[in-house]
Each structure stands twice: as C-alpha cells, then as structure tokens.
Amino acid sequence: ATKLTEEKYELKEGQTLDVKCDYTLEKFASSQKAWQIIRDGEMPKTLACTERPSKNSHPVQVGRIILEDYHDHGLLRVRMVNLQVEDSGLYQCVIYQPPKEPHMLFDRIRLVVTKGFSGTPGSNENSTQNVYKIPPTTTKALCPLYTSPRTVTQAPPKSTADVSTPDSEINLTNVTDIIRVPVFN
C-alpha cells in the first residue's frame, strides 16, 4: 500500500531546495499543479502553481519558487532558491482538478532551514541543493484561491513517529539531510 510520508530536508540559509513530486501521467499530465505550505491548524496555502493547462518543461517562477512540470514523465520539479529561516515548514504538491478537491501528491516535505555558512559553490560541503540558475523563460501563473480542507493535518508528534534515517552507507550530508517519517498507512 502507498504510504503518505514526510521527508525532512535540513538546509542552510541561501541554499536551494530541489525536489520532485510524481503523479499519474495518464490522469494528470496537463492538470494544473501547485506547491503549498501547511501551517499547523491552518488551511494549506498555495505559494505557486503551474499554468492551466500545465505546459511541458516550461518553468514558472513565483518569487523564489520555480516549478517545472515534466509532462512526459509525470514529474513536477520544485525549486525554492535562496532559502530563509522563515521558509521552514511542511510543504506538499497538489493537483488542481476542479470542481473536485485538489489531489495531494506524495511525499510531503518537512523543510528545516537554519542559519549558517552554506559554503561556496564547488566545495565538498555543497550539493545540488546549493546550485541554481535562472531558467531562460519564466512565467507567473495565476493560482486558484481554494484549497482542500481534507489536506489540513498535523504531522505526528516526534515521540510517536516511526523515524528511519537514510541507509548508513550513504553520506547524505553531501546530498541533503533527509529523514523519512510515515504519516499514516
């Protein structure tokens, strides 16, 4: 069975979060997709969305967020550049499918941004999470105002969460520090 999980990314100020959300190609290729933040006890807030219909491999930039929808592969790529401490929070990808409620994608991203020197590009402390180049063409898309009450949930308390760290043989400090936390089965 598919598990809805959280993946924790611990990054420094100035670095880039670079993640992907996969979706069912046949159902959602041209659907409008969005990147949302979920604050405890609040409705999910849409921060950026693709165009409607979503265009293939066409970067959409809203502030420091860049979305790129690879239709042919059923992948939405999300980049948040020049991260700030206040960007910390729980994020998710959703697919808009009016008049139905938005369809939530796996996995949720728990972003923790801390202050500190993020290194210089090219150093071994860095990863693609630091690397960013502005796409050649970007478009700001208008996002629907509604969000789904169904997606308002809180992460399980840390004491009861089944936390499994990445495989010990991988040095994930050079990739990004990720912890996978199942939310429900």
């Epitope: 598919t2 993946e7 996969d22 992948l75 991203i109 071994n124 693609t128 690397v131 180049k133 991988i170």
Partner: antibody, heavy 123, light 107 residues
C-alpha cells in the same frame, strides 16, 4: 548492504515481450526510485525511465513510451520492467538502478546498480 | 534533449600518468553532472556526483570540476585498476542523458 539482483538472461523473438525483474534488499524498497538503464553491446548507456515504488508512478523516455511498462511488488521488494514489440536493436544489457537520494529528491545520481540482464532479440 | 559530448572517445595512458577527460553539454546544466566508471562485463559505478563531489569509498585520485557547459574529470595518478570506460551524465532536466563514453586503455 544495498543489493539489486536481476533475473537471468533472455532470448526473445522479434515482436515478443520480455519482463525483467529486480529484487531489492538492504534498504526500504518504497523509499527510493528505481530507474532502468540499458546498454547495447559495445555501446553507451541509455536511460529508459524511472518508477517510484511507493506511489507506483513511473515515466519513460519518448522512444520507449509505447512499449515499456514499469511495475513493482512491494510485498517482495521487486521492480519489473516489461518491454514489448521487441526488435533486434533492443538487444542489450538492461540494468535496474537505485538513486542516491530519497524519491522526493531531485537528484538523479545512479548509486546502486543491479548486475544487469542480457536480453537478446533474434529470429 | 541535452547532448553530452565526451572527449577523447579513447585514450592510452600509463600507470602513474595524470589523465583528463572532458564532457561538454549542449546547454548550461549548472552542476547537475555525474561521472561513472565501467569495467568490461560489469555494471557502471558512480564516482563523482554534482560535478565535483566524490562518492563515498571512491579514491581521492579521482576528481571532477566544472559548471555550466564544460566539465573535467581527472585521475591524478593512474592505477592499474583504473583502466575502464568512463561516462558523464547530466540531470539538469528530463530526459537524463549520458556522454558516449571514454575508453581508457593501457599504453
């Protein structure tokens, strides 16, 4: 340790299908995407596509889209790649590969490789 | 699709030599580039990821550099076990593509 063990060599006739299996062990199968890469004899590497074992979603490059199906059985931690309408140019070694980072990371670094499965298409 | 061009396609060198292989992308791929080593009859092995990061357990004689369109892979002092074929691979966008490979042979 992480291991990807693939099924044995296959000989197929043109027009037939082949299904290659890839059994994963040493890690949580549903946490990492499985990709498929092929290599024709004496040739370079060619990426075919990916599958997220948790969601079951997959994607493949245009040239394979109508012929390839990527599936998984989470109960046995096994990924499958089926290629149909085989032609002689599909003769190659097929590799299943696990990425370096979790499924949500946009990081396509192929860290763990299966031993490869030779598929020969000949009439 | 982004084309990756490796040069040279083959190269002869001796143990102890410094060897350099280049990889050129058809457009800017930032640092989204990996390097692999493949020995005959074996699966490829990840050596360098994100242009310059050494994969865990890979000897420090291997290194990578570059960003944008031009990348370099270097073996500082060639060892007998390093004779193999080397591939670059980008992942700046989808689809992912590999270079055609560089075969490193004993002189």
């Amino acid at each position: 340790q992480v291991q990807l063990v693939q099924s044995g060599a296959e000989v197929k006739k043109p027009g037939a299908s082949v299904k290659v299996s890839c059994k994963a062990s040493g890690y949580t199968f549903t946490s990492y995407d499985i990709n498929w890469v092929r290599q024709a004899t004496g040739q370079g590497l060619e990426w075919m596509g990916w599958m997220n074992p948790n969601s079951g979603n997959s994607g493949s490059v245009k040239k394979f889209r109508d012929r390839v199906t990527m599936t998984r059985d989470t109960s046995t931690s096994t990924a499958y790649m089926e290629l149909s309408s085989l032609r002689s140019e599909d003769t190659a070694v097929y590799y299943c590969v696990r990425l370096i980072g979790y499924s949500s990371a946009y990081k396509w670094s192929f860290q763990h490789w299966g031993q490869g499965t030779l598929v020969t298409v000949s009439s | 699709d982004i084309q990756m061009t490796q040069s040279p396609s083959s190269l002869s060198a001796s143990v102890g030599d410094r060897v350099t292989i280049t990889c050129q992308a058809s457009r800017d791929i930032s640092k989204y580039l990996n390097w692999y080593q493949q020995k005959p009859g074996k699966a490829p092995k990840l050596l360098i990821y994100d242009a310059s990061n050494l994969e865990t357990g890979v000897p420090s004689r291997f290194s990578g550099s570059g960003s944008g369109t031009d990348f370099t892979f270097t073996i500082s002092s060639l060892q007998p076990e390093d004779f193999a074929t080397y591939y670059c691979q980008h992942y700046d966008n989808i689809p992912i593509t590999f270079g055609q490979g560089t075969r490193l042979e004993i002189k």
